[in-house]
Interface confidence: low
């Protein structure tokens, strides 16, 4: 059929609940490109009718919820002008038996349900939800060991919980909760994640690499959008936030009410040694209040910035 | 709106069976926790019996393990609790409840209850 296969990716899901896995892969998608999802090499796509249990939503392949008999190799084909690209996913769903401990927990966990604390720091964990702008997540709630976490401790913030000075003790199960509506139902999303401790810093006390941007400047014009990448390397034990601030506040709360600067859901492509994370930040339209700002991108304790600039004046025009 | 049903009460021998049924109308999403408590008069409201919305988990209360099992249907839409070997301490109205968490304590029989939505009850009265 002329596509070229990218690449398979294996997800281990729990039954019962909501998933969500959007096609993308830059730089393929970034154009003019239409996506379509498929189950199972079936030449028939999945429904695009939002009513339906599983059905497409733009990029995404969304199951409300998640089911048994959903296990399955789906494929989503990536079509531009002259070019067919496939991205396999390889879905296992299984029945997660929360609260009872005589039942083993999730099998083959992946990265984002194992997380590191180090001891005697301020650490955090994150909860995984990625989800179309279809789904509206409600606030998420901690437990451990299926008790709600409370302390002075713990704090929620976004999707992640903040824990101060860690201690042996935090180590254990762990779920993330959030109640996600999607065409006026509701459904609970629930993340379970393993927690270990580590007296390590991290890889050798390594930080984290920004690969880009590189503290300069980007030329752009007035009104036009622009979408800029984070590209950071991590240690894959690693439990640092990576954000975009400007005059030290995140942009999504620094433009709050216009929402006219957003940080977009960060991704990351896993790599035998490390981690390499993107988080992107969309200027829906530049306004001459951005020029000269540094809008910066946070890794844990390192920070890259952007300064937009006026594109200089092209005298060639007069 | 929600609503929560439940039927199958009614007067019944030491050693009997009854069958409780609880019928729920008006979700708006996907329960993921149901069950079944009790309440004697001037006693604690307790915990029976729970099941998990994927059907597979299922908590107990000591005092009925052996004699009551919860179950649905295919919709996930009716929950059942099989009453056998009835006592006379069994004697309480039963309500359904259902809630959007198969976390938190209330599944698994913990004393705060934090389900969403319960019906009004039924009476089972064992006595001869």
């Known amino acids: 059929d002329g596509c070229k296969d990218i690449f398979m990716k294996n997800e281990i899901l729990s039954a019962s609940q909501p998933f969500a896995f959007n096609c993308t892969f830059p730089p393929i998608t970034s154009g003019e490109v239409s996506v379509t999802w498929y189950k199972n090499s079936s030449k028939i796509p999945v429904s695009k009718i939002i009513q339906s249990r599983i059905h497409q939503d733009e990029t995404w392949i969304l199951f409300l919820p998640m089911e048994w008999g959903d296990s399955g190799v789906y494929q989503c084909v990536i079509k531009g002008r002259d070019s067919c690209h496939r991205i396999h996913v390889n879905l296992t769903v299984f029945e997660k038996h929360w609260c009872d401990t005589s039942i083993g927990g999730l099998p083959n966990l992946s990265d984002e349900y194992k997380q590191i604390l180090h001891l005697g720091k301020d650490d955090s964990l994150t909860c995984h939800l990625h989800f179309p702008k279809s789904c509206v997540l409600g606030p998420i709630k901690w437990y451990k060991d299926c008790n709600e976490i409370k302390g002075e401790r713990f704090t929620v913030l976004e999707t992640r919980l903040l824990v101060s000075n860690v201690s042996a003790e935090d180590r254990g199960n762990y779920a993330c909760q959030a109640i996600l509506t999607h065409s006026g139902k509701q459904y609970e999303v629930l993340n379970g994640i393993t927690v270990s401790i580590t007296e390590r810093a991290g890889y050798g006390g390594s930080v984290p690499k920004i690969i880009y941007p590189k503290n300069h400047s980007i030329e752009v014009q007035l009104g036009t959008t622009l979408i800029v990448d984070c590209n950071v390397t991590d240690t894959k034990d690693n439990t640092n936030l990576r954000c975009w601030r400007v005059n030290n506040t995140l942009v999504d709360d620094y433009y709050d009410e216009s929402k006219r600067i957003r940080e977009g859901v960060e991704t990351h492509v896993s790599f035998r040694e490390h981690n390499l994370y993107t988080v992107n930040i969309t200027f829906l339209e530049v306004k001459m209040e951005d020029y000269g700002l540094p809008f910066m991108c946070h890794a844990g304790v390192s920070t890259a910035y952007i300064i937009l600039q006026l594109p200089a004046p092209d005298f060639r025009a007069y | 709106d929600v609503q929560l049903v439940e039927s199958g009460g009614g007067l019944v021998q030491p050693g009997g069976s009854l069958r409780l049924s609880c019928a729920a109308s008006g979700y708006s999403y996907r329960t993921q926790c149901l069950g079944w408590y009790r309440q004697a008069p001037g006693k604690q409201l307790e915990a029976v019996a729970t099941?998990?919305?994927?059907?597979?988990?299922?908590y107990y209360s000591d005092s009925v393990k052996g004699r009551f099992t919860i179950s649905q249907d295919n919709a996930k839409t009716t929950v059942y609790l099989q009453m056998n070997s009835l006592r006379a301490e069994d004697t309480a109205v039963y309500y359904c409840?259902?809630?959007?968490?198969?976390?938190?304590?209330?599944?698994?029989?913990?004393?705060?209850?934090?389900?969403?939505?319960s019906g009004q009850g039924t009476l089972v009265t064992v006595s001869s």
């Open positions: 099941i998990s919305g994927g059907g597979t988990s299922t």
């Open positions: 409840a259902a809630g959007l968490s198969v976390l938190g304590s209330w599944c698994h029989g913990g004393s705060s209850y934090e389900y969403t939505y």
